[in-house]
């Protein structure tokens, strides 16, 4: 495939990445799959600057990101190291709360109304943000 040099229509370019902001809600796994089908991934926040950019675009709305601990350790969907990476949890989060009564704890991370992160039940239908890097090879065949 060819290297992507500009963002697809309706995506927003920022710091060599392209972002797409949903206006509807999906469960985390469905949001994750949506982004993958777009040759992208749920947003991976690697800096305070990127956090502010995403926060500005989503507003005060619960929004999924590409961070989960469904297998135990916290993991970013693109393989970015959680331990050494940027974190912006709300105070006392993540808490893996069981009190919702839906079964299990809380395994998926989202932006809250103030932008800081919370873990929540992955089945909740929140908005989501997809991200893809401009410098990565596209799956699409090159234009002739």
């Amino acid at each position: 495939g060819s290297e992507r040099t500009c963002c697809p229509v309706n995506w927003v370019e920022h710091e060599r990445s392209c972002y797409w902001f949903s206006r509807s809600g999906k469960a985390w796994a469905d949001a994750d799959n949506y982004c993958r089908l777009e040759d992208a991934h749920l947003v991976v926040v690697t800096s305070w600057e990127e956090q502010k950019f995403v926060q500005h675009h989503i507003g005060p709305v619960n929004t999924w990101m590409g961070l989960h601990d469904q297998n135990g350790p916290w993991k970013w969907v693109d393989g970015t190291d959680y331990e050494t990476g940027f974190k912006n949890w709300r105070p006392e989060q993540p808490d893996d709360w069981y009190g919702h009564g839906l079964g299990g704890g809380e395994d998926c991370a989202h932006f809250t109304d103030d932008g800081r992160w919370n873990d929540d039940v992955c089945q909740r239908p929140y908005r989501w943000v997809c991200e893809t890097e401009l410098d990565k090879a596209s799956q699409e065949p090159p234009l002739l």
């Epitope: 135990g72 350790p73 006392e92 808490d95 893996d96 009190g99 299990g104």
Partner: antibody
Framework: EVQLVESGGGLVKPGGSLRLSCAAS????????MNWVRQAPGKGLEWVSS????????YYADSVKGRFTISRDNAKNSLYLQMNSLRAEDTAVYYC???????WGQGTLVTISS | DIQMTQSPSSLSASVGDRITITCRAS??????LAWFQQKPGKAPKSLIS???SLQSGVPSKFSGSGSGTDFTLTISSLQPEDFATYCC?????????FGQGTKVEIK
């Protein structure tokens, strides 16, 4: 490398007390719930207690409720289990485990005998 | 409390065999199930979480399946290092509960 190291086990008389510690390293301790799980000699695993990342939520098995207290110190990357009114049936290897058990310590043996 | 029942409690098998261990929950637990391996005198090792997700570093000869109340752990080709005790655990709700274990021995 993720490491959990338990300490504080030993031989105690029935009715006595013991405090177990678990020192964590190699991961962001404050991002994870932590647990104590025990295994009596020749028996299966038994969940004992869990504590959320910031101690907001604490859970106990009925068999230890009112006698055991779980706590943590995120500044010290440490998990604790205060065990009071110990009984012979509390004799076991006690393991500390992260989240749902993705990593475990090597265990510390607690023996309750007169 | 949710009871977890494993079968068989023990089995004998040869190197190269494919084996399956079953775990049944007394009520539906969706996919909130983990599998562990334990060798004598050692701490348990996590193999699978969320019923079918292989833990990092665990070889692909291990696989898990199931949802609701019935779950299986399969080892596709037993190797000498796989002879151990295997147990399941539900984390759907507190108190978390374990199966009684299945001891896999050399035939």
């Amino acid at each position: 490398e993720v490491q959990l190291v338990e300490s504080g086990g030993g031989l105690v008389k029935p009715g006595g007390s013991l405090r177990l510690s678990c020192a964590a390293s190699g991961f962001t301790f404050s991002s994870y719930s932590m647990n104590w799980v025990r295994q009596a000699p020749g028996k299966g695993l038994e969940w004992v207690s869990s504590i959320s990342s910031s101690s907001s939520y604490i859970y106990y098995a009925d068999s230890v409720k009112g006698r055991f207290t779980i706590s943590r110190d995120n500044a010290k990357n440490s998990l604790y289990l205060q065990m009071n009114s110990l009984r012979a049936e509390d004799t076991a290897v006690y393991y500390c485990a992260r989240d749902r058990g993705s990593c475990w310590g090597q265990g510390t043996l607690v023996t309750i005998s007169s | 409390d949710i009871q977890m029942t494993q079968s068989p409690s023990s089995l004998s098998a040869s190197v190269g065999d494919r084996i399956t261990i079953t775990c049944r929950a007394s009520q539906g637990i969706s996919n909130y199930l983990a599998w562990f391996q334990q060798k004598p005198g050692k701490a348990p090792k996590s193999l699978i979480s969320a019923a079918s997700s292989l833990q990092s570093g665990v070889p692909s000869k291990f696989s898990g399946s199931g949802s609701g109340t019935d779950f299986t752990l399969t080892i596709s080709s037993l190797q000498p290092e796989d002879f151990a005790t295997y147990c399941c655990q539900q984390y759907h709700s507190y108190p978390w509960t374990f199966g009684q274990g299945t001891k896999v021995e050399i035939k």
